[in-house]
Interface confidence: low
Amino acid sequence: EPPTACREKQYLINSQCCSLCQPGQKLVSDCTEFTETECLPCSESEFLDTWNRETRCHQHKYCDPNLGLRVQQKGTSETDTICTCEEGLHCMSESCESCVPHRSCLPGFGVKQIATGVSDTICEPCPVGFFSNVSSAFEKCRPWTSCETKDLVVQQAGTNKTDVVCGPQDRQR
């Protein structure tokens, strides 16, 4: 009796189970009662990443430099090319079809996590005792100057955007 289902890595065709082609290979002809499934490797610019019965391999993704993209990992016959963004840019979406510039953290905010090719700058508000007076994609919040360690006193309190201002202690005569 002809099978109605096949084992893993097989497919049903003409009432018989044929082997799927392995990743990196495409189907040339189905198996018959007398012959095995015939598969051929994908060409250099193509891939197939699963056990399959595809008659065509997929083209590797093109990392278009005009969109700010560059190759992070070259594709193989079994894997697609992975694109990432040029320096100073990050992917706009998970599929990384185009890039946008990294954000700066505004004064009062410091960099919690520096941007990468795939993620934007993550900023955090400077907590009490820390400040950032610049708009930067790299600088963290910096601690207020400790006037005491310099034998000075606080003349002006710090804010999340400004450092404390130290001055000399009033000397008693």
């Epitope: 005009n66 969109l67 185009s98 510039p101 505004l106």
Partner: antibody
Framework: EVKLQESGPSLVKPSQTLSLTCSVT????????WNWIRKFPGNKLEYMGF???????YYTPSLKSRISITRDTSKNQFYLQLNSVTTEDTATYFC????????????WGQGTTLTVSS | DIQMTQSPSSLSASLGERVSLTCRAS??????LSWIQQKPDGTIKRLIN???TLASGVPKRFSGSRSGSEYSLTINSLESEDFADYYC?????????FGGGTKLEIK
């Protein structure tokens, strides 16, 4: 001085394609991000998308299926195409420049009013 | 999308008066907020960018501030040319989104 000027038809019939041009002077469309924004009769503003210095584009998800933003660097112009328009697309359309996060959207066109009606 | 809730939707004020408009962001926008002005003739002008930076050529009577997720535009001593529509715009994440607007009218 940077100037942006929108141009295009003032009346389009439903189901037709809307094509608008933004002509840029004082800057190059090969640098920065060039945006389309529209304002509906009820005063609601909607961001539509951009074309970047490199030619990459972003479209707001609700318009993705019928919008296209292109450019011609030799003419220093960028374009909006909106397919299958309906009366809901009646609005004033603005083009605008965005260059740096610290500066925000720094230059706007004066807007062009479009009515969709049969 | 990030929702920007702007208030009030309309405001009547007298010349010389001080007024404040606010916008609240539904998600963190890290200070990437602009205030724009639309005059009756339709022209749009940027007043404030990055929450509190005055755009070049904008009079000093305009100022922007932030408190948490709430952003404010204050106009000190209103002048006749200030009567217009005002919108906030978040450009922290795509798609950019706008507040519903405030119509500032002469009392």
């Amino acid at each position: 001085e940077v100037k942006l000027q929108e141009s295009g038809p003032s009346l389009v019939k439903p189901s037709q394609t809307l094509s608008l041009t933004c002509s840029v002077t004082g800057d190059s469309v090969s640098s920065g991000y060039w945006n389309w924004i529209r304002k509906f009769p009820g005063n609601k503003l909607e961001y539509m998308g951009f074309i970047s210095y490199s030619g990459s584009t972003y479209y707001t998800p609700s318009l993705k299926s019928r919008i296209s933003i292109t450019r011609d660097t030799s003419k220093n112009q960028f374009y909006l195409q909106l397919n299958s328009v309906t009366t809901e697309d009646t609005a004033t359309y603005f083009c605008a420049r965005f260059r740096r996060y610290d500066d925000g959207v720094d230059y706007w066109g004066q807007g062009t009013t479009l009515t969709v009606s049969s | 999308d990030i929702q920007m809730t702007q208030s009030p939707s309309s405001l009547s004020a007298s010349l010389g008066e001080r007024v404040s408009l606010t916008c609240r962001a539904s998600h963190e926008i890290s200070g990437y907020l602009s205030w724009i002005q639309q005059k009756p003739d339709g022209t749009i002008k940027r007043l404030i960018n990055a929450a509190s930076t005055l755009a070049s050529g904008v009079p000093k009577r305009f100022s922007g501030s932030r408190s948490g997720s709430e952003y404010s535009l204050t106009i000190n001593s209103l002048e006749s040319e200030d009567f217009a529509d005002y919108y906030c715009l978040q450009y922290s994440s795509y798609p950019w989104t706008f507040g519903g607007g405030t119509k500032l009218e002469i009392k």
